[in-house]
């Protein structure tokens, strides 16, 4: 997990989230996303 402080004076928390592809489809392997401020953006 990484934490970045911006000039605006507040902190934005970035967290890598990993899901298994087979939970959402038929593929295997892992899906990696990025959560910023509570929202998964990638």
């Amino acid at each position: 997990d990484a934490e970045f402080r911006h000039d605006s004076g507040y902190e934005v928390h970035h967290q890598k989230l990993v899901f298994f592809a087979e939970d959402v489809g038929s593929n295997k392997g892992a899906i990696i996303g990025l959560m910023v401020g509570g929202v998964v953006i990638a």
Partner: nanobody
């Protein structure tokens, strides 16, 4: 939820190997992605590895990639963690945990069932 019981911990020399086992009770075992976490003395609990419900997919923390192997046997309701090339920094209590499908498998909050842990000490 499932009940989880770890075994296989112990004292091992640097460079050695251990195999941890996690026995699960409950008929819904194959509904859960399974993970291993560890907690070193004075530190937080950290993700180690996870295996998908089918056992086909796995994911590892960078610190153990290439040294540890996670697997599962759904016919025995058991998850394994084969640990090779152990280092002193691998010393920790190792916990088995279960996460329901569709949740992020690398974060602690996804896991709602936990074992009591088994201690692994790597020292000469």
């Amino acid at each position: 939820e499932v009940q989880l019981l770890e075994s296989g911990g112990g004292l091992v020399q640097p460079g050695g190997s251990l195999r941890l086992s996690c026995a699960a009770s409950g008929r819904t075992f194959n509904n859960y992605n399974m993970g291993w976490f560890r907690q070193a003395p004075g530190k937080g609990r950290e993700f180690v590895a996870a295996v998908s419900r089918s056992g086909v997919s796995t994911y590892y923390a960078d610190s153990v990639k290439g040294r540890f192997t996670i697997s599962r046997d759904n016919s025995k309701n058991t998850v394994y963690l084969q640990m090779n090339s152990l280092r002193p920094e691998d010393t920790a209590v190792y916990y088995c945990a279960a996460a329901y499908r569709g949740t992020a498998i690398n974060v602690r909050r996804s896991y709602d069932s936990w074992g009591q842990g088994t201690l692994v000490t790597v020292s000469s």
